[in-house]
């Protein structure tokens, strides 16, 4: 978070920013930035595997829900979108693309279909769906 | 938009940012930043007048919809929220808080109730509502 004073080295201008204000990012151009995470909602419907690859090609991952507080903007998301949550049949757990296990009480998992992938829906719900079904998807990039 | 190189004058560190990435803002702390506009969704229900005052107290205004392209994140917003659109009975027009007239084809206006204020709903719909009815609201701050 960059606050108080910025020096734009390209133009050598001093820019005053109120201490209560800050810059967010960096994010890919035209992505949503919130609490220093970057999000993009993609309109085209793809299956989970193609959605995953699409996010990766943009140096991102499918949505990972890790905090209701830091990601409270997700409460208000309309419709269903692929996120990076997959079911591991061997141990029955749900895990994110980075291999971390879904924390309890973060998502309400709802069995909509038989499947090993999950769609994000508003108010922190995860709908189980067949990974081959086309859906819109949310990519996320965490800023350092 | 701050890209390529930033100088953080507080720590005098040079930070390399890919040219395809950029900072967004500045915005009030923990607001959503998108295409250099700042947005915040407020959970508490207030009537239109209180909502307007709340946004003003945060150096912002109620949501102004001015571009489907620049504000396409609004497509996916769930539920109904006060925006800064009011009906002017004298000439029958709808105008924003800044006095500008609602551009044609930006919003589909739907008469839900008799009233002179409007709620924003997903996919660029505006629902007419009595200004005294409590609702959640969206504040917006345009960055320079």
């Amino acid at each position: 978070i960059w606050s108080a004073v910025f020096l734009n080295s390209l133009f050598n201008q001093e820019v005053q920013i109120p201490l209560t204000e800050s810059y967010c990012g960096p994010c890919p151009k035209n992505w949503i930035c919130y609490k220093n995470n970057c999000y993009q909602f993609f309109d085209e419907s793809k299956n989970w595997y193609e959605s995953q690859a699409s996010c990766m090609s943009q140096n991102a991952s499918l949505l990972k829900v890790y905090s209701k507080e830091d990601q409270d903007l997700l409460k208000l998301v309309k419709s269903y979108h692929w996120m990076g949550l997959v079911h591991i049949p061997t141990n029955g757990s749900w895990q994110w693309e980075d291999g971390s296990i879904l924390s309890p009480n973060l998502l309400t998992i709802i069995e909509m279909q038989k499947g090993d992938c999950a769609l994000y829906a508003s108010s922190f719900k995860g709908y189980i769906e067949n990974c081959s079904t086309p859906n819109t998807y949310i990519c996320m990039q965490r800023t350092v | 938009i701050w890209s390529a190189v930033f100088l953080n004058s507080l720590f005098n560190q040079e930070v390399q940012i890919p040219l395809t990435e950029s900072y967004c803002g500045p915005c009030p702390k923990n607001w959503i930043c998108y295409k250099n506009n700042c947005y915040q969704f407020f959970d508490e229900s207030k009537n239109w007048y209180e909502s307007q005052a709340s946004c003003m107290s945060q150096n912002a205004s109620l949501l102004k919809v001015y571009s489907k392209e620049d504000q396409d994140l609004l497509k996916l917003v769930k539920s109904y929220h006060w925006m800064g659109l009011v009906h002017i009975p004298t000439n029958g027009s709808w105008q924003w808080e800044d006095g500008s007239i609602l551009s044609p084809n930006l919003l589909t206006i739907i008469e839900m109730q008799k009233g002179d204020c409007a709620l924003y709903a997903s996919s660029f719909k505006g629902y007419i509502e009595n200004c005294s009815t409590p609702n959640t609201y969206i504040c917006m701050q345009r960055t320079v």
Partner: antibody
């Protein structure tokens, strides 16, 4: 059991285009979870990823080769192909085709036997 | 790009000895790390996926561990047929990258 077989010329002249084909047998090239890749290994060196393709035609390339590489798929022939233009001696390598079974982040679980391509005049 | 480093480059080991090969990523890759074995004049063969997941048909003496940036491949009781080069591979982000390899020789 899925098997992969690379084919194509073993010798390519500098500045020309290297063309290889991988034929998939014993399984479907259009399975929704499969991605198909090209990987190479210069003599006595390590492995280098070239790129991936999905049956829909979506491609993902190594940025250092992006301007020279094209990967395509022909689902009717159960084949995917690699074209690498403007080759130099540095492109001399054993070229492997491989598969990811469960999405692009999965491991390469099946490999072809590899084909040596030498770039020389 | 994510740079993968491996150590050691080379290891000469007696049969039945325990072998440990480490792989380090230049940034966190979660568990998106896979191990391959390559014998001379053969194509690589998958040993372990997602850092620690065993592969059907691979002897149980091969195991993997780690998360984030540091990973380990362990061969519990080396056999003569394990003489090969071992490579780690990250699939967390494009471009996919491999470690430089560790050559294991039988004494």
């Amino acid at each position: 059991q899925v098997q992969l077989l690379e084919s194509g010329p073993g010798l390519v002249k500098p500045a020309e285009t290297l063309s290889l084909t991988c034929t998939v047998s014993g399984g479907s090239i259009t399975s929704t979870s499969y991605f198909w890749d090209w990987i190479r290994q210069p003599p006595g060196k390590g492995l280098e990823w070239i790129g991936s393709i999905y049956h829909s035609g979506s491609t993902y390339y190594d940025s250092s080769l992006k301007t020279r590489v094209t990967i395509s798929v022909d689902t009717s022939k159960y084949q995917f192909s690699l074209r690498l233009s403007s080759v130099t001696a540095a492109d001399t390598a054993v070229y492997y085709c491989a598969r990811h079974e469960f999405g692009i982040r999965d491991a390469f679980d099946i490999w072809g036997q590899g084909t040596l391509v030498t770039v020389s005049s | 790009e994510i740079v993968m480093t491996q150590s050691p480059d080379f290891q000469s080991v007696t049969p039945k000895e325990k072998v440990t090969i480490t792989c380090r990523a230049s940034q966190s890759i979660g568990n998106n790390l896979h191990w391959y074995q390559q014998k001379p004049d053969q194509s690589p063969k998958l040993l372990i996926k997602y850092a620690s997941q065993s592969i059907s048909g691979v002897p149980s003496r091969f195991s993997g561990s780690g998360f984030g940036t540091d990973f380990t491949l362990t061969i519990n009781s080396l056999e003569a047929e394990d003489a090969a080069a071992y490579y780690c591979h990250q699939s967390n982000s494009f471009p996919f990258t491999f470690g430089p390899g560790t050559k294991v020789e039988i004494k």
